[in-house]
Amino acid sequence: MMCLECASAAAGGAEEEEADAERRRRRRGAQPGAGGSACCGARGVGGAGVVSADEEVQTLSGSVRRVPSGLPSIPSTPGCAAAAKGPSAPQPKPASLGRGRGAAAAILSLGNVLNYLDRYTVAGVLLDIQQHFGVKDRGAGLLQSVFICSFMVAAPIFGYLGDRFNRKVILSCGIFFWSAVTFSSSFIPQQYFWLLVLSRGLVGIGEASYSTIAPTIIGDLFTKNTRTLMLSVFYFAIPLGSGLGYITGSSVKQAAGDWHWALRVSPVLGMITGTLILILVPATKRGHADQLGGQLKARTSWLRDMKALIRNRSYVFSSLATSAVSFATGALGMWIPLYLHRAQVVQKTAETCNSPPCGAKDSLIFGAITCFTGFLGVVTGAGATRWCRLRTQRADPLVCAVGMLGSAIFICLIFVAAKTSIVGAYICIFVGETLLFSNWAITADILMYVVIPTRRATAVALQSFTSHLLGDAGSPYLIGFISDLIRQSTKDSPLWEFLSLGYALMLCPFVVVLGGMFFLATALFFLSDRAKAEQQVNQLVMPPASVKV
């Protein structure tokens, strides 16, 4: 399944938009307005949000008044009104999408699809890998955990390099690197499982270069609403690529009659995409640091930013909740196709697999569900939040909490249904995943509300790192480890292969419930933290001497 880089990184791109708007206002001498980054301040959004230069926040899930409850509404100054209404106010320009820039964004998005396709092809042929290398569940889980760990460690390094060196070259080299490693890994002999584990770690490094640098190029190719739209397309590649990974894995191994061929598809496409990036993606200039950002950065160190974020309870709790989502998606994405295959063995609708290709149908169906629920979840979450905002200002974290708790119920039901009905299990997976993915865009919005603009990039990076560290970096291995542990203490048999993995996966709904609790905790502090953030933003646009952070 997918990681949550999706929403949070789109948030990072949107941060620049707010800064752009702020810079323009400062040049025109606009005064700070009520409860916003400025009177006409636009809020960056994650997912598929739209940034408006109005005093409403235009997000994927609708528009929200900027003034938080509990804060007195400060009347707009005449200057602000003039800035908003007068001829000098920046008018939204029609999106003049150059063919070249559009092609570049499309290729970068295609590359992101391939990143996730490659990542989840392994999950699609997991049963075959276990059979070929003769490894238990913990060994299979290690493949994804090693990948995520190396990805997690490499991402900040590439972020640093991407700010200093030729991004296009780093990007292409990253794709060529992981393509070569994945292709080579399809020839590993069965006695060298450790080499496959190592190769997945190296692939994680290669893919980290892409995930960190590609969004920044899109950020520099486009501005305003077009940028948000392009980033949304880029991140919607995650559910699409993940689902296609399962589908590619299962269908290619069926067509070729050998699972090894599944690992040879994404490298070929990767090489082509890497070449297209070198040819078609323009060498863009990095966006200049805006005045507001410069003013703040002169007064705060990275350490101070980190301290402020750790003290921000809404941010901390929402980050922990995001980690819970990441834990569940990482574990379920890795193990559900295999679990459903084992369920069918027990139900006698499939045989225990001894010679590949194995469990192709389950990976295929699961892939299709993952693709669809990725989209449906974002739309559902956005719609629910829009509706709830009419009733409560704590809508964002509350919708996330309800989504998580609802998801936990359906994830639990997967294990009940799988004993008697595979179709029933798939229905539970569909609903559970949709509810789980419904908080993608909303989580990014929460971050935007409670973290000041000039701290958001750090906040996004830290949240992404935390969600991997506490989430999907360890969960696939942990589930495999628990499954093996249960089998050791009971017995090894077809029934216990199924039951032990099911019992191990039961950890996921508990973690999801914990995530729901964290979102409820976020709701408790959301309004006060939002008010604090808006107060700080108001102070930021005052003369430099009076800035306090």
């Epitope: 063995v345 697999c353 001894n354 194995c358 090894d492």
Partner: antibody, heavy 118, light 111 residues
Framework: QVQLQQSGVELAKPGSSVKISCKAS????????ITWIKQTPGQGLEYIGY????????YYNEKFKGKATLTADKSSSTAFMQLSSLTPDDSAVYFC???????????WGQGVMVTVSS | DDIVLTQSPALAPSLGQRATISCRAS??????????MHWYQQKPGQQPKLLIY???KLASGIPARFSGSGSGTDFTLTIDPVQSDDIATYYC?????????FGAGTKLELR
């Protein structure tokens, strides 16, 4: 369905060993678990143990530990059971069977008659 | 302790009648929603053949006149109506605990 083909009749002297085979064929989707069952007129059906042909892991009924040794050759899809230190009590029909589903014996070999006499 | 399965030793129904074979376990064989009791038929000189698994589910290729019922410790195999082809020994087997154990068998003979 998988077909399990067992080796022929075995005649052995007390104290010697015999190794009987069970070759799986037919459907490529075969059980990972090949089990062995002993049948005597007096004792009925007795479960000896299994070998997981995927992992090579074995399980033995306490009663048959030291008596039976289970092995498998993945390349030829064949499971083996060696019976050592034979006594007349070991005279029986030995079946191999695939363990599947909720741990039942789905497909059975035709059985091998082992006779131990001096 | 190993689970002991006790079967009635013999049964002699008339052709076309209903035959009921019982099997009692020394402890419950129910686990995780499954009744881990299975039934096999063995004709003279042949290998056993699976009839019923999970107490009540009919194995593939087995005629519908065979049915299984029961839960926990008491289980029944029913043949209705009995045909001449059904002359055999019927065994119950549990898979809840290692080692898996079989009943001593019930011999079905026609009256």
């Amino acid at each position: 369905q998988v077909q399990l083909q067992q080796s022929g009749v075995e005649l052995a002297k007390p104290g010697s060993s015999v190794k009987i085979s069970c070759k799986a064929s037919g459907n490529t989707f075969t059980s990972n678990y090949i089990t062995w069952i002993k049948q005597t007129p007096g004792q009925g059906l007795e479960y000896i143990g299994y070998i997981n042909t995927g992992s090579g892991k074995t399980y033995y009924n306490e009663k048959f530990k030291g008596k039976a040794t289970l092995t498998a050759d993945k390349s030829s899809s064949t499971a083996f059971m060696q019976l050592s230190s034979l006594t007349p009590d070991d005279s029986a029909v030995y079946f191999c069977a695939s363990l599947t589903g909720v741990d039942y014996f789905d497909d059975w070999g035709q059985g091998v008659m082992v006779t131990v006499s001096s | 302790d190993d689970i002991v399965l006790t079967q009635s030793p013999a049964l002699a129904p008339s052709l076309g009648q209903r035959a009921t074979i019982s099997c009692r376990a020394s402890q419950s064989v129910r686990m995780s929603g499954y009744n881990l009791m299975h039934w096999y038929q063995q004709k003279p000189g042949q290998q056993p053949k699976l009839l019923i698994y999970d107490a009540s589910k009919l194995a593939s290729g087995i005629p519908a006149r065979f049915s299984g019922s029961g839960s926990g410790t008491d289980f029944t195999l029913t043949i209705d109506p009995v045909q001449s082809d059904d002359i055999a020994t019927y065994y119950c087997q549990q898979s809840k605990d290692d080692p898996y154990t079989f009943g001593a068998g019930t011999k079905l003979e026609l009256r």
